[in-house]
């Protein structure tokens, strides 16, 4: 053995293995990654843990382990096992964890696993299993966790699962399952987590999930579903549902009516065109709802009873109006993204007191009333670009003390109210051709970035000094997560991921040079100095 000192080597430690005593004077034996082709023969009866993973073991003789009545965990992962005979695990009365992943099993052993009464966790993933014998799991009354992912199953082994009434988590992901039959999991009333992602599932029996009364997490991501999985309606405890990356084209009315506990629904990367207006009603735990490009949606969804929603993204649809009482339904909303719709008029959003980010770019909005954004004390970012806004009420932005980013680019503005905007760090007004007046820089003591319709308007902001990567800075804080919006922003924005690091450092260096001067574009530049621009302005 290779334990600390020569005197400390416990008796019954196979050569080259690493052994130590656990707190109960039982032996933990690590024989992993030693190039073994067979099981060590002189194992102590008092072994509680045996790791034989990452070796070259191709056979498990029926009698070698039967004396290890204290063995609780047996690791045989990453070997060359193609078959496990009946009796291989006989006598392992204390066995709780059995790891057989990354071997070459073509079927679950027919009898070797039966009646391991203490077994709680069984890993059979990453083999070549295409067949699960009907009675292979019989007698596994304590089994809680079963891994069968990354195998070659074409069907759910319905009969084999009938004896696993204590099972709490199971993964059948990364197989070749094409259909789930009615009552496929009918006896798994304790199952909490079921992973079916990365299969070839194209159809679900209407009652395929019946019996899963404890299920909280269901993952159907990366399959070939053409229709919404209506079979979820009996899953009254479901909290997390994933069916992203399928081929689902519509979400029906009252789609989640049987799932009032849903907290998270992932359904992106589906060609969803239509969503029933009542689909997301009465989901009191739902925090985030994101739907992009559902071009057949014309009406804002009914969200009665979904009052804890914090982030709502409904982009690329044909929504032309919002309900007047939208904020009565959504008092906890922090992020509202309705970009790329057909909104013309906006109701008052003042009831959405927690709003931090609003994105309404690419709509048909023509006017911002005084009441629209009143008293949104937490609002930090407001994007109204690419609309038809010609009129903004003088006090439209007067009660937005946290606002630091305002984008009004590509509208029809001829004037711009500055009341209440003294905290802005970013302002975009480019593309408003009728906006010709100079905006006094004194109104924006915190401003870092500004984009104006014309170069001469930058002169008020010391515009000749810097050329700057403005668009990069503008978007730096636009992470969609609500948590990102909580982070305090001192003009230098959070690095979202490692790819941004280089840009961030360059910008940081530029900031240090510029100190607190405003970066304004389009910059007058050396060939159009401010003096020249002011001259032509005065002549004009």
């Amino acid at each position: 053995g290779s334990s600390p000192g020569p005197d400390a080597i416990p008796r019954g430690c196979p050569s080259h293995c690493h052994c130590e005593l656990d707190g109960r004077m039982l032996l933990r034996v690590d024989c992993s990654d030693l190039g073994l082709s067979e099981l060590p023969s002189n194992l102590s009866v008092f072994t509680s843990y045996l790791d034989l993973s990452m070796n070259n073991i191709s056979q498990l003789p029926a009698s070698l382990l039967h004396r290890l009545c204290f063995l609780e965990e047996l690791r045989l992962a990453g070997n060359a096992l193609t078959h496990i005979p009946k009796g291989a695990f006989t006598g392992l009365h204390s066995l709780k964890v059995l790891m057989l992943q990354n071997n070459q099993l073509r079927q679950v052993p027919e009898e070797a696993l039966q009646n391991l009464r203490s077994l709680q966790s069984l890993r059979l993933d990453a083999n070549h299993i295409s067949y699960v014998p009907p009675s292979c799991f019989s007698g596994l009354h304590s089994l809680r966790h079963l891994w069968l992912d990354d195998n070659a199953l074409t069907d759910v082994p319905v009969q084999a699962f009938r004896s696993l009434s204590a099972l709490q988590a199971m993964t059948l992901a990364l197989n070749k399952i094409h259909h789930i039959a009615d009552y496929a999991f009918g006896n798994l009333s304790s199952l909490v987590v079921l992973h079916l992602h990365n299969n070839r599932i194209h159809s679900l029996g209407k009652k395929c999930f019946d019996g899963l009364h404890s299920l909280e997490t269901l993952d159907l991501n990366y399959n070939n579903l053409d229709e919404f999985p209506t079979a979820i309606k009996t899953l009254s405890n479901l909290k997390e549902l994933g069916f992203h990356s399928n081929n689902i084209r519509s979400i029906p009315e009252r789609a989640f009516v049987g799932n009032p506990s849903l907290i998270t629904i992932h359904f992106y990367d589906n060609p969803i065109q239509f969503v029933g207006v009542s689909a997301f009603q009465h989901l009191p735990e739902l925090r985030t709802l994101t739907l992009n490009g559902a071009s057949h949606i014309t009406e804002f969804p009914h969200l009665t009873g979904t009052a804890t929603l914090e982030s709502l993204t409904l982009t690329g649809a044909k929504i032309s109006s919002l309900p007047q009482a939208v904020c009565d339904q959504l008092p906890n909303l922090q992020v509202l993204d309705l970009s790329y719709n057909l909104l013309e008029d906006l109701p008052s959003l003042s009831g959405c007191q927690k709003l931090q980010k609003i994105d309404l770019r690419h709509n048909e909005i023509y006017e911002i009333k005084g009441s629209t954004f009143q008293q949104l004390f937490n609002l930090r970012s407001l994007n109204l670009a690419w609309n038809k806004i010609a009129i903004i009420h003088p006090n439209a932005f007067s009660t937005l003390p946290s606002l630091i980013k305002l984008d009004l680019s590509s509208n029809l503005l001829s004037s711009f109210p500055v009341t209440g905007l003294h905290g802005l760090t970013h302002l975009k007004l480019t593309g408003n051709r009728a906006l010709q007046s100079l905006i006094p820089s004194a109104n924006f003591p915190e401003l870092k970035i500004i984009e104006m319709p014309s170069a001469y308007q930058c002169c008020a902001f010391g515009g000749c000094e810097n050329v700057y990567k403005i668009s990069n800075q503008w978007n730096k804080d636009d992470g969609n997560s609500v948590d990102d919006l909580h982070k305090k922003d001192a003009g230098l924005f959070q690095v979202q991921d490692e790819r941004d690091l280089e840009d961030f450092l360059l910008d940081f260096e530029e900031d240090l040079k510029a100190l607190h001067s405003v970066q304004c574009s389009p910059s007058p530049g050396p060939f159009k100095p401010c003096e020249h621009l002011f001259g032509s302005w005065l002549i004009r």
Partner: antibody, heavy 118, light 111 residues
Framework: QVQLQQSGTELMKPGASVKISCKAT????????IEWIKQRPGHGLEWIGE????????DYNEKFKVKATFSSDTSSNTVYIQLNSLTYEDSAVYYC???????????WGQGTTLKVSS | NIVLTQSPASLAVSLGQRATISCRAS??????????MHWYQQKPGQPPKLLIY???NLESGVPARFSGSGSRTDFTLTIDPVEADDAATYYC?????????FGSGTKVEIK
């Protein structure tokens, strides 16, 4: 414990409609299908159809599609069957039952007797 | 529709003896290894009571003298030994396919 309580005996005239109720207690109402079964002396048991309470999911035996309509009210945990254009052949005992283990009917209401006579 | 034919129509059994009831389906009711056949007991003036589900699984609370067997199209309900309380009509039912159907019933009398 699980119980299904049905409404009482109904005496109706031909051509009329009747609505029979089935109130469920003791389990998560919306998680199990409710089945409706008709029993006439000498005709055995006939499956009318099923409803998943609270949802729009229903299934009808083709034979009863015109005759029966199911509905549910989750606020009172009650399922209903409406039978219309009543004839003498509709006289029977109507049972609601819960679709339990693998769709077997594990709990039954006590039955509602419908008598159609002029 | 799947037709379930029960036999015999009636059966008289002595106390302590074995009663065997047969149910034959017009087509297989097996799916992925499960046989979607169930057995019920009905006494006069009462609703049916579930005894056996999926051909051979005893419903909780049902005495072990009841047992079920069979697959595909041929199924059997056995009561062994019969007790006085077992006098009733017994029905098989399939839910493999809509519309779900019942057998015509077997009336068991105790001699």
């Amino acid at each position: 414990q699980v119980q299904l309580q049905q409404s009482g005996t109904e005496l109706m005239k031909p051509g009329a409609s009747v609505k029979i109720s089935c109130k469920a207690t003791g389990y998560t109402f919306s998680a199990y299908w409710i089945e409706w079964i008709k029993q006439r002396p000498g005709h055995g048991l006939e499956w009318i159809g099923e409803i998943l309470p609270g949802s729009d999911s229903t299934d009808y035996n083709e034979k009863f599609k015109v005759k029966a309509t199911f509905s549910s009210d989750t606020s009172s945990n009650t399922v209903y069957i409406q039978l219309n254009s009543l004839t003498y052949e509709d006289s029977a005992v109507y049972y609601c039952a819960r679709g339990g283990h693998y769709g077997s009917l594990d709990y039954w209401g006590q039955g509602t007797t419908l008598k159609v006579s002029s | 529709n799947i037709v379930l034919t029960q036999s015999p129509a009636s059966l008289a059994v002595s106390l302590g003896q074995r009663a065997t009831i047969s149910c034959r389906a017009s087509e297989s009711v097996d799916n992925y290894g499960n046989s979607f056949m169930h057995w019920y007991q009905q006494k006069p003036g009462q609703p049916p009571k579930l005894l056996i589900y999926l051909a051979s699984n005893l419903e909780s609370g049902v005495p072990a003298r009841f047992s079920g067997s069979g697959s595909r199209t041929d199924f059997t309900l056995t009561i062994d030994p019969v007790e006085a309380d077992d006098a009733a009509t017994y029905y098989c039912q399939q839910n493999y396919e809509d519309p779900f159907t019942f057998g015509s019933g077997t009336k068991v009398e105790i001699k």
